[in-house]
């Protein structure tokens, strides 16, 4: 997404949020 | 300093739909993931979803038929919305940067009351 | 009904060595080091002392430490002030339910 937008889209299934949670968690030891 | 502010109506009727707003400083909703966690009287923290970084949303999936999160990036806010309210949804409502493993920085939640 | 299982309640004494358990499955805590712990104060927002199963937040006292084996993680504290008494929950990514909260732990300082 842009800066500036609304972002609504969904995401159809949990399996991604896994790659999202390990992103996040990264970012903490930085 | 990274900072996150719930806002919104305290008290809410059954069947209407509770509408919450997330607004962020000190980092942005674009690289970072925003959670919603609730928490009723005494009981447990319930995860409700969050807004990924990469603009995907994923939902608590008891939840996902009357759960909506949206993402305004030029406002750095991210929105809750929650249908067909019940006593039941009755909570400390919490946004926080993160997912749920990690959730590093919380607002100081607000406390939405289900009653007619 | 949390899917993760804790102690109700657990208690020790000034300086004493303690630990919470948290119990799931291979959905959650067995799935990877997707866990977090966090320490709640009645009438204040959690706040997150683990991440990632066993690497401390920023500033958290190095007495607290995490670990995971299998579809168990624990928090343990080495050596317990009277500042710790509070809630304690643990926190997992979950494959089937998204994220989920443990059942919660009060831990009671005694003397």
């Known amino acids: 997404s842009s800066t500036g937008s609304i972002d609504m889209v969904d995401s159809p299934q949990l399996a991604t949020l896994a790659d999202e949670v390990s992103a996040s968690l990264a970012k903490q030891g930085l | 300093q990274v900072q996150l502010q719930e806002s919104g109506p305290s008290l809410v009727k059954p069947s209407q739909t509770l509408s919450l707003t997330c607004t962020v400083s000190g980092f942005s909703v674009i690289s970072d993931s925003v959670a919603w966690v609730r928490q009723a009287p005494g009981k447990v923290p319930e995860w409700l979803g969050a807004s990924g970084s990469s603009g995907n949303k994923y939902y608590n999936p008891a939840l996902k038929s009357r759960l909506s999160i949206t993402r305004d990036t030029s406002k750095s806010q991210v929105s809750l919305s929650l249908s067909s309210v019940t006593t039941e949804d009755t909570a400390v409502y919490y946004c926080?940067?993160?997912?749920?493993?990690?959730?590093?920085?919380w607002g100081r939640g607000l406390l939405v009351s289900v009653s007619s | 009904q949390a899917v993760l299982t804790q102690p109700s309640s657990v208690s020790g004494a000034l300086g004493q060595r303690v630990s919470i358990t948290c119990s799931g499955s291979?959905?959650?805590?067995?799935?990877?080091?997707?866990v977090g712990w966090y320490q709640q104060v009645p009438g204040s927002a959690p706040k997150l002392l683990i991440y990632?199963?066993?690497s401390r937040a920023s500033g958290v006292p190095d007495r607290f430490s995490g670990s995971r084996s299998g579809n168990t993680a624990t928090l343990t504290i080495s050596s317990l002030q009277a500042e710790d008494e509070a809630d304690y929950y643990c926190?997992?990514?979950?494959?089937?339910?998204?994220?989920?909260f443990g059942s919660g732990t009060r831990l009671t300082v005694l003397g």
């Open positions: 291979s959905s959650n805590v067995g799935y990877g080091d997707y």
């Open positions: 926190a997992s990514y979950d494959s089937s339910d998204g994220g989920v």
């Open positions: 990632g199963a066993a």
């Open positions: 926080a940067r993160g997912i749920i493993a990690g959730v590093d920085v």
